[in-house]
Structure formats: C-alpha cells, structure tokens
Amino acid sequence: SGVFQLQLQEFINERGVLASGRPCEPGCRTFFRVCLKHFQAVVSPGPCTFGTVSTPVLGTNSFAVRDDSSGGGRNPLQLPFNFTWPGTFSLIIEAWHAPGDDLRPEALPPDALISKIAIQGSLAVGQNWLLDEQTSTLTRLRYSYRVICSDNYYGDNCSRLCKKRNDHFGHYVCQPDGNLSCLPGWTGEYCQQPICLSGCHEQNGYCSKPAECLCRPGWQGRLCNECIPHNGCRHGTCSTPWQCTCDEGWGGLFCDQDLNYCTHHSPCKNGATCSNSGQRSYTCTCRPGYTGVDCELELSECDSNPCRNGGSCKDQEDGYHCLCPPGYYGLHCEHSTLSCADSPCFNGGSCRERNQGANYACECPPNFTGSNCEKKVDRCTSNPCANGGQCLNRGPSRMCRCRPGFTGTYCELHVSDCARNPCAHGGTCHDLENGLMCTCPAGFSGRRCEVRTSIDACASSPCFNRATCYTDLSTDTFVCNCPYGFVGSRCEFPVGLP
C-alpha cells in the first residue's frame, strides 16, 4: 500500500490556445486530469489501472501551481494504491479548458483538450522527487513525482505491513525494510521476550520484564545462582536445592548435631587439652596444678602434701615451702636428726632403730602413712576409678563417683543405654562408649528416630529430559530443575525457543 504523488509546478500556454489551435475565450481556464496505470511500452488509452485524479481549475493560460496540501491534498496530487508497487508505471497528464463550472468529462466538448502528455518507466519507492518537463508545440508542463509507502507499510515495494507496538505481543519499532527492531530490553521473534538482569542464571532464573531476575523454586540471590538449602538446615550448605551438606564438625539431617564441641565451645580452661568424644561430649586433660571436669579448679601446690615428717606446707608465689618440725630438715623435711628416743612416730606408730641407733623407721597403724606416720592415707592417689570416675575419700575407705553411662565400685561397668529402648519408630539401638546411636528406618530421623521425614520422592525418577530431582522434605514432594529448553513440573515439555 502506498501513494503515487504528482506535484504540478508550472504550466505554460502563452497563446492561450487549445490542442486544435483554436484560442480559448476569454482565456484557457486550465484544469488537469491524471491517469496512472501499469507499464506499457507504448502508452495507450484505456483503464487507469493504478488510479485517476482530477484537479479544479488551477489558472488561466500560463501559471505556476502553488503547493497546497490543505485542500484535500490538491498539490501534490495523491494517487493511492492498495497493492505491491511493481516498480514500473505509465502516466498520462491531460490539460483541459473549462468553459463552465462543470468539469465532468461528459460535460465538456471533446475539443476542450489543451494538451496531453504520456510517460512511462521505472520508479523505485523513495522520498526523493523526480523532476520532469514535457514540451509540445504550444505548451510546456513542469512537474515532479514520486512513490512513497502509506503509513505502516515498508520495503522496496510497500508490501510489508509493520506497526510499531509496545505491549505483550511485541515491543518494537519498524525498520525501513519492514523488519522489527526490538526496543531496549526485549528480544525474540516478536520482541516479546524480556532480556533478564545481566548474569541472571539461564536455567534457575527468568523474568517477565527487562532487567529483572525472578528465581525458580529452590534458588535465591540477585542472580538466582544460590541454592536454597533444606528447610531447617543449621550448620550446612547446598550445591543443589534442598540439600544440607554439613559444615566440618556438624552432623545430622539438619547439621544441627555438634560433633566438634571442643572447637565450637572451647570448654577446657587453663590451657588444658580438649578431646572430642562424641556428640556434645568431650574430655579435658588438665595441666599440672589444675583439676575439675573443665580443669577450672586451681590446685594448691600444698594439696599434694609434699612435706614429710609432719612438716607444715606454706603456699608461695613460686611454689611452696616446708616448715619442718624439730629434728627434721631438707626441702621436704625428709632428713631426720632424731632417733627412737625422741618418739618420732605419730598416730600410734611404733619406732624401730636402724643403723645402730643412727636412724629409725616407723611402723604405722592402718589409715596412716609417711616416714613418721604423720599422714592420713589417701586412698585415691592410685586413681582406682575407671572411665573418668571421680575418687572420693570416705574415712578409712574410698568411693568412686561415676560418669553417666558407667557403674560398679570402680566405675568399671558400662551401663547399657539401650536397655530402656530409647529408639522410636522401630529404630535399632547401638551402645557407644559415650552414649548410644539409633539407626532409623526409612521415613524417620533424629537422634532417637523421633522426626518423621519424607521418603525420597525422587526415588521413582519422576523428572524427564535429564532434569535434576530434589526431594523437598518439608512438603513430601519432589522438585525438578529443568535443563535449558524444557519446562513443566516434571520438565516434560520442550520450550519453542526463538
């Protein structure tokens, strides 16, 4: 669809005569008839296949024709066509004399013709005007013409309809050849697909408008390149959605079970060495001078009763000092200047002379010890309590206070934690050195198999087209992560890619 435009510029008829040579009275009131038709090697009369147009009276004898687009497109003259422009044409321009006001062909005498010109040739669509001048014996006509496409028609022959649009069926303008030129941020055959935020993950992200990045289920982050771990995952990460891969030192389905209490909580004090011994379980090895489960208690250096022969111990900043009783000397009052005559044996001990009276030895009654029977017996010095039990002196005897899970006089017996059937939902119980462990049946988890979890929804391989399946334990369902080019909850539908 387009328009053949003819711009009349000047008509010269100096003598004011008709084609027959007869003069017009009082002058030639001139109007034009234009016939546009298909190309003919010799232009002949006949149907004006591309259209016709007539002008009103434009002047008398010789005159210039003013541009006038306001009066219904009078000059240039418009010859619209609703077909593909063929690139060739024939044009007939007739100048007529109008004796009266009726310009209809049937109202004019045949000899009212002033002049007739006919041209033919090639004409490409374009904005540029072609200037032409046709001269006969008595007249001259100067004019220009061109073919332009109608609004929304494009291409070399005005055959391509294209209307710019900016709605969900396309976001584009039209190029001179009629092809679409997408507006910024849009792509696709009809410019209907938004260009997502730069870097938005191809499979895990999408958008409904440009520079957006919306995440598919299981993904998060500005570019939808971060997986969402399993709901409730505490100390773990994921490489694919709904996973919970535990950080070092953590265990369990939700990575909430502390397997490295020593590192995470540093329970041992005063430079003691910490050893992990199970979930939330540890042992502290104290440096000399400290005691307690966490080595939190400072031992006095005198607590080990280093002074012999009844010497009294005094704590000092850099250690201790023994105050020896009469007749003894040395760092620990270990040397005697006494003999049996000095009654050196305390607490009912009996004295025996040695080395011809130069020395002696005390034989102590039960519950007393030391070279002078000056010390009560500490029945705990030999560490008789096993499995970390704490030894307590109780008069002439001793007792062991056992750690959880142990019993017996010396804490030598391991209590079976499984005896009370702690594993729920048919879990199998295993005794460990530091407690117990439950092996849970399918569908259950937790330390005691008390947590109901979903059976692996991915076990049946529900995803198609090499999609990755993730079990969503929170909803007992699966999620398929589709490869590029497939959609659907099971990735079963191929996408018609542009």
Partner: antibody
Framework: EVQLVESGGGLVQPANSLKLSCAVS??????????WGWIRQSPKKGLEWIGD???????YYNPSLKSRVTISVDTAKNTFYLQMDSLRSEDTATYYC?????????????WGQGVLVTVSS | DYRLTQSPASLSASLGETVNIECSGQ??????ASWYQQKPGKSPQLVIY???KRPSGIPSRFSGSNSGDQASLKINSLQSEDVATYYC?????????FGGGTKLELK
C-alpha cells in the same frame, strides 16, 4: 489439531468465587508463540476480554476486572485457569478460553466451546 | 478507556452482494485489527488478522483494510454460510478491546 476445553461453570452465589479450567490438547501450553486468554460474552456487554497468561506465568488483565481476577497456568497439566472473586449478577456470561497468537498480532485463532456461568442467589 | 464502534449494528444483504462492515476507534490505523465471525450458539472464529490477512481455511471473499481511524471488513459475493455476527478487535496497550458487533442477515 489444538483443542481448548473449558470446565467449571454453573450456578454461583453472589459474592462467591469461581474457578474455571481450560485444558489444552494437541499442542503444548509451553509454546513461546502464544498467550492463553479468557474472554466472556453477555447479551448486555458483548465480547469482553478478561486477561491472558504466558507459559512463563506473566499475566495481563483488563483494568476493569483486575482486582477480582487471577489467571494461572499448570504446564504439567497443560491447563490454564481463571479465578474470579466477589461475583455479581453482571458477571453472568458465557466464558471462553482462547489461544492468542503472536504471529497473528494477538489474534485469537483457537477458541474453546464456552462455558456458561450464572451468578444468582 | 479505548472504544471500538461498529457500524452498522445490523444489516440485511442479498446472496452474491458485497457487504462492508466498519469499525472505528481513535488512531485505529496504528493498531492491528482482527475480525471474528460468530454464528448462533457457536464460539467466535478468526476471519481476518493484522488488518488484512486471512487465516488458512478462510475464503478469499473476506478481506480487510485499516487506516486512519477506521478498519473495514469486506465480504464479496455474500454466501448463505456468511450469515453471522461480526466483531472487530484490537489491542490498546496490554488490553484486548472488542467492537459491539454487526449482525448480518439475508434479505
């Protein structure tokens, strides 16, 4: 050949909600070449476009109905839906689902058979 | 709100006659117009899209044009099976808009 079949119509009480389904067969709803739309027709208002949806989930609604309408898609079931809330008597109409082709400038080249919805107490 | 006005609302024509149905709307020529035929008790059927294109299966006697503020549907040599109501449709931004319809009957 692609076919669209609506379901879920019938008598609905005023102020209640309605959910219509449009099952697509003979072609994939996940095609990038089409939007899937809902249009209704009543003697009083003639044909009235309600809204449409792309397979990605992008939706467009008639501004006059937007506050009461939700269109959704289930690509696995090859079905799209129209949910309409707070129904009134003037929502009584035959509801059509249609395929709107990008290659046809948005023209609806396939229609369902229509389903009658009557809103009345 | 964008409006499409169809004229006439109804018309009677004889078999073999040429029928013209008009659809007017502000700057309609800058939009793509579609035309639908709906027979009683049936769903609408697309007969013209993008102003003047015919879907496959639509007879060549149906033609369309669109410029300025007006789109037209022309039916050459009217046949009995053409008796129906015809609707024009266009898109205004992201909203579909239909004309009020023209009921075509046989004389």
């Amino acid at each position: 050949e692609v076919q669209l079949v609506e379901s879920g119509g019938g008598l609905v009480q005023p102020a209640n909600s309605l959910k219509l389904s449009c099952a697509v067969s003979g072609g994939s709803i996940s095609s990038s070449s089409y939007y899937w739309g809902w249009i209704r027709q009543s003697p009083k208002k003639g044909l009235e476009w309600i809204g449409d949806i792309y397979y990605t989930g992008s939706t467009y609604y008639n501004p006059s109905l937007k506050s009461r309408v939700t269109i959704s898609v289930d690509t696995a079931k090859n079905t799209f839906y129209l949910q309409m809330d707070s129904l009134r008597s003037e929502d009584t109409a035959t509801y059509y689902c249609a395929r709107q082709a990008l290659a046809m400038g948005g023209g609806s080249d396939k229609w369902g058979q229509g389903v009658l919805v009557t809103v009345s107490s | 709100d964008y409006r499409l006005t169809q004229s006439p609302a109804s018309l009677s024509a004889s078999l073999g006659e040429t029928v013209n149905i008009e659809c007017s709307g502000q700057r309609l020529g800058d939009k793509y117009a579609s035309w639908y035929q709906q027979k009683p008790g049936k769903s609408p059927q697309l007969v013209i899209y993008e102003d003047s294109k015919r879907p496959s299966g639509i007879p060549s006697r149906f033609s369309g044009s669109n410029s300025g503020d007006q789109a037209s549907l022309k039916i050459n040599s009217l046949q009995s099976e053409d008796v129906a109501t015809y609707y024009c449709q266009a898109w205004d931004r992201d909203t579909g808009v239909f004309g009020g319809g023209t009921k075509l009957e046989l004389k």
